[in-house]
Amino acid sequence: EEELQVIQPDKSVSVAAGESAILHCTVTSLIPVGPIQWFRGAGPARELIYNQKEGHFPRVTTVSESTKRENMDFSISISNITPADAGTYYCVKFRKGSPDTEFKSGAGTELSVRAKPS
């Protein structure tokens, strides 16, 4: 069986301040079992943007019903975008365990923020 891939189709996304940003992410397999997390940045200091399992993410909603067992679309929408939200966002698949371990990352989507249209 082919190994799971994490696909972030958009290399970059540009959004006007105040609008919502949709960041696309799909996986190609249901195996291994485990959650998806979204991060801004790479490396040790990356910021957690969304965790499928738990957490407080008031500006983030999932585009599809990510809790459904057969779901393979883990795209998210971030509301009320400001210039402080600019950065590269990564969709990361984890393998279930204690603790969950990182399995594979998408290539990243760079979010840039345009000035609010007057």
């Epitope: 490396g43 040790p44 200091a45 990182e102």
Partner: antibody, heavy 117, light 108 residues
Framework: DVQLVESGGGLVRPGESLRLSCAAS????????VTWVRQAPGEGLEWVSL???????YYADSVKGRFTISRDNSKSTLYLQMNGLRAEDTAVYYC???????????WGLGTLVTVSS | EIVLTQSPGTLSVSPGERATFSCRAS??????LAWYQQKPGQAPRLLIY???TRATGIPARFSGSRSGTEFTLTISSLQSEDFAVYYC??????????FGGGTKVEIK
């Protein structure tokens, strides 16, 4: 307002242990990496250790194998377990919130650790 | 490990004057350099990151620039509250995160 409050510093003898705590508030603790930075009396800043949002830990060579960083997300608290303390570990220890840019945007006021016989 | 060398060690400036000091990296860090201000008995405060981006709430009199591996922090017109020690820090993606030795800006 973001607040970081360190505690647990004090005077210990060489070879002894100490555990520092850093209570965080004003931000979603689980979403950010956090770090310890120290400053010996009259000296500059030295990065000590960092723990990522997923719990991966990183250490300066000078403390590797002696210090252990950990976090309790349910308590929004960062810890630094310091074993085998040496005179050269004497410093003010600061905890700081780390941005995704790898910079330290909020700092606590620090707690003084003195290692002396 | 990336070594950061700050110069001068001490800078004597009169209030209202311009202050400029530098930080040189031993190897390339791109634009990943930050500046912090520390006053006696206080914690450091983030001023600048990515070589020239001011942190939230930092006045426009503070500016940063880069030329290769040499970075400069400029305070256009020194206020009394600006007399402090200034540290640079490289913030490339992976530890160890290193700091320069500091530049003390004192009243002339």
């Amino acid at each position: 307002d973001v607040q970081l409050v360190e505690s647990g510093g004090g005077l210990v003898r060489p070879g002894e242990s100490l555990r520092l705590s850093c209570a965080a508030s004003g931000f979603t603790f689980t979403n950010y990496a956090v770090t310890w930075v120290r400053q010996a009396p009259g000296e500059g800043l030295e990065w000590v250790s960092l723990i990522s949002v997923t719990g991966t830990t990183y250490y300066a060579d000078s403390v590797k194998g002696r210090f252990t960083i950990s976090r309790d997300n349910s308590k929004s608290t960062l810890y630094l377990q310091m074993n085998g303390l040496r005179a050269e570990d004497t410093a003010v220890y600061y905890c700081a919130k780390v941005t995704w840019k790898n910079v330290f945007d909020y700092w606590g006021l620090g707690t003084l650790v003195t290692v002396s016989s | 490990e990336i070594v950061l060398t700050q110069s001068p060690g001490t800078l004597s400036v009169s209030p209202g004057e311009r202050a400029t000091f530098s930080c040189r990296a031993s190897q390339t860090v791109g634009s990943k350099l930050a500046w912090y201000q520390q006053k006696p008995g206080q914690a450091p405060r983030l001023l600048i990151y990515d070589a020239n981006t001011r942190a939230t709430g930092i006045p426009a009199r503070f500016s940063g620039s880069r030329s290769g591996t040499e970075f400069t922090l400029t305070i256009s017109s020194l206020q009394s509250e600006d007399f402090a020690v200034y540290y640079c820090q490289q913030h490339t993606d992976w530890p160890p995160y290193t700091f320069g030795g500091g530049t003390k800006v004192e009243i002339k």
